[in-house]
């Protein structure tokens, strides 16, 4: 499939101009290669009309130009003084005409409307409101006012001042008489439909002295805005329908066959299953505008999207709408990453998150997608040393391994941790990736005591048992804090006896704290890694108390079977105030994020339930 993309259909009227934008992947080769616009012949072939190398056909002399915008990966063809002869099938493309790096465009130029003299033209968008003004003279002030629509040769009554309303206009039309002083009556039609377009006649009086005024109503179907995004990337649809629909339910739908438009998401709580975990509808502003973010773009997401407003939360005749044509470029710069990570209760996961490696200094974030209230993604951790309170001691974001990948480690897993998470940065907003954490049956691989109490001034030894399957891994102990996990010296105490059917390659590695102080209190992790790549971890909370009896402490696994330290999250932890990025610019626009970590809830972001790419978590 060609990665070139443009408008499938362009419609205009004789004498007008058109501007056609074509998109291409902005590789260095593509940026510098020839761009062209050609007309397809009946027997195949495509005759160049204009190219970026300066060629302009005589048919286009003085009325067309082609401009390349290499930084955007677009070029624009402008054609003026259109005639019906310009109607036809064209291609915009790169390289040589016959190579196939092109996109087919159909241009339709229609004749301008033949209007009667003194006709007022009203041009209004589909779903909007039109007010047709009808002047009259004093002698007709007390007489019947009416509006007719010309259907073929016959005028059909639409509305009149005696209370008649044509059934096609019921509930969306009114006739206003301004008071005799103004000598004007108005007909207001709401929720305009394409079928409302045509010639109208307004009339005051019924005899030969009646006042008449012709009106031509043109109802415009919105031209879709072209959107070109990378596979696995994200897209934001900004929908501004105007303050008159501020209190009406909003929706985003995707056109399927024919006129059907399947709801993707709406403000009434509906969401298509294919977008679970990877879509957010940002809250609407007072003016009724809102935006929808979709991440983890798939090939099948390509197509025409409409946003609109209707009390049903779906497209109906007369809904005001905005349209986009989304093209998903399969020649993506965004790397693949596992979309599913598995862990066991009590175990851990280490998630590798990709980011744009040109933006190594950007702030990295990890958030939990929540489906309620149209979707939201409250932050859990960032690379600046902030961790959401309920995750202290069990969540860490590491800049390693770096150069396009960062790591998020979450341990002490429970079934409540299952769900969709987003990796994102405050840099390139197209690089938002989604991972689903699944909690599966099994036991954690690493064995540590459940809770440990150290005595001030004494020595504490905490064991961590590693099964033999980790023999090729580096084993470590570290002390958790908001900015990561600082490595500590540890002792390899030889084979562990904690595992059945495990040979000499199992290991017992102990953490020793000498002369314990209050500062030693906190969370400690033992884990495995290979270089800068982190695997499984286990967490222990060390409490420090006053000396009761002399001697050092050596904690065994037997003591670990006591109830775990009560840092365990309570069942309602998701309802506790969420730390979140509230600034929707992080998700909605290509702008830096304001530091909003101390704001209340309301973040907006998005996720890829993606293919079944899987990365293991804790245990198999």
């Amino acid at each position: 499939k060609s990665p070139i993309f443009g408008p499938e259909e362009v419609n205009s009227v004789e004498g007008n101009s058109v501007s056609i934008t074509c998109y291409y992947p902005p590789t260095s080769v593509n940026r510098h290669t020839r761009k062209y616009w050609c007309r397809q012949g009946a027997r195949g072939g495509c005759i160049t009309l204009i190219s970026s190398e300066g060629y302009v056909s005589s048919k286009y002399a003085g009325r067309a130009n082609l401009t390349n915008f290499p930084e955007n990966g677009t070029f624009v063809v402008n054609i003026a003084q259109l005639s019906q002869d310009d109607s036809g099938r064209y291609k915009c493309g790169l390289g040589i005409n016959s190579r196939g790096l092109s996109f087919d465009v159909s241009l339709e130029v229609s004749q301008g409307p033949g209007l009667l003299n003194d006709t007022k033209v009203y041009t209004v968008d589909l779903g909007r409101t039109v007010t047709i003004n009808c002047p009259f003279k004093t002698e007709n002030a007390q007489k019947r006012k009416s509006l007719y629509k010309q259907i073929g040769l016959y005028p059909v009554l639409v509305i009149d001042s005696s209370g008649y309303v044509n059934p096609n206009y019921t509930g969306r039309i009114r006739l206003d008489i301004q008071g005799t002083g103004q000598l004007l009556f108005s007909v207001v039609i709401n929720q305009l439909r394409l079928s409302d377009a045509g010639q109208y006649l307004c009339q005051a009086g019924d005899d030969s002295n009646s006042n008449k005024k012709n009106a031509d109503l043109q109802v415009l179907k919105p031209e879709p805005e072209l959107v070109y995004e990378d596979l696995r990337g994200s897209v934001t649809f900004h929908c501004a329908l105007g303050p008159e629909v501020a209190n009406v339910a909003k929706f985003l739908c995707r056109q399927s066959s024919g006129e059907n438009c399947d709801v993707v998401v709406n403000t009434l709580g509906k969401r298509a299953p294919a977008f679970e975990g990877r879509i957010l509808l940002n809250p609407q502003d007072k003016d009724g505008s809102f935006s929808v973010v979709i991440t983890g773009l798939r090939k099948e997401d390509a197509g025409r999207y409409l946003c609109g407003a209707h009390s049903d939360g779906q497209l109906q005749e007369g809904s005001p709408i905005q349209a986009w044509q989304l093209f998903v470029n399969e020649e993506s710069t965004i790397p693949r990453s596992p979309t599913v990570v598995k862990g066991v209760a009590g175990g851990s996961v280490a998630v590798l998150c990709p980011y744009n490696r040109k933006e190594s200094k950007s702030i990295k974030y990890w958030c939990l997608w929540e489906g309620a209230q149209n979707g939201r993604c409250p932050l859990l951790v960032d690379s600046e040393g902030w961790v959401k309170a309920q995750y202290e001691g069990r969540l860490s974001l590491l800049e390693e391994p770096g150069n396009g990948t960062f790591t998020v480690i979450l341990n002490q897993l429970t079934s409540r941790d299952a769900g969709f998470y987003w990796c994102l940065t405050n840099g390139d907003t197209l690089w938002r990736t989604t991972v689903e954490i699944k909690i599966i049956e099994g036991e954690p691989n690493l064995k540590v005591p459940g809770n440990v109490t150290a005595v001030l001034g004494e020595t504490l030894k905490v064991p961590c048992h590693f099964p033999c399957k980790f023999s090729s891994y580096e084993k470590y102990w570290c002390k958790w804090n908001n900015t990561g996990c600082q490595a500590l010296p540890s002792q390899d105490e030889g084979p562990s006896k904690a595992f059945v059917n495990c040979d000499e390659n199992s290991r017992l590695v102990s953490l020793t704290l000498n002369l314990v102080t209050r500062a030693d209190e906190g969370w400690y992790w033992c884990g495995v890694k290979q270089g800068h790549f982190y695997g499984e971890t286990a967490a222990v909370y060390v409490a420090v108390e006053e000396r009761k009896a002399a001697g050092s402490r050596d904690v065994s696994l037997a003591k670990a079977d006591a109830a775990p330290d009560e840092k365990v999250l309570d069942s309602g932890f998701r309802e506790i105030e969420n730390k979140a990025i509230q600034d929707p610019r992080l998700f909605a626009e290509e702008k830096a994020v304001a530091d909003t970590r101390d704001q209340a809830d309301g973040s907006r972001a998005s996720v890829d339930s993606g293919s079944s790419e899987e990365q293991g978590g804790s245990s198999r």
Epitope: P354, G402, N403, T405, N445, H532, F533, G535, G616
Partner: nanobody
């Protein structure tokens, strides 16, 4: 089904070079970090090197740092290990593995590297 097939091993003199390859199939290769591990005769598994899915980040065990280079070609679904300045203690069976952080043991046959004069 995940399949990893190593090749490129052989007998080489100390100071010599070899390039190992690992052909991957059955999973989306570019999504995963990949690792090389080795096992000498009568020894446990030893980690050698690891590379991120996009190839941007690599790590090496101290014993091979400066001598070995890991790389990948995602278009060909292939992982490489360039081994220079080989020493007798590098003699081992070398395995490639998909990184999962779980201690999953290599399921492949491996390729034998023998460094001897």
């Amino acid at each position: 089904e995940v399949q990893l097939v190593e090749s490129g091993g052989g007998l080489v003199q100390p100071g010599g070079s070899l390039r190992l390859s690992c052909a991957a199939s059955g999973f989306t290769f570019s999504s995963y970090a990949m690792t090389w591990v080795r096992q000498g005769l009568g020894k446990g598994l030893e980690w050698v090197s690891i590379i991120s899915g996009n190839g941007g980040s690599t790590s090496y065990a101290d014993s091979v740092k400066g001598r070995f280079t890991i790389s990948r070609d995602n278009a060909k679904n292939t992982l490489y290990l360039q081994m220079n300045s080989l020493k007798p203690e590098d003699t081992a069976v070398y395995y490639c593995a998909k990184w999962d952080g779980l201690g999953t043991l290599p399921g492949s046959q491996g390729t034998q590297v023998t460094v001897s004069s």
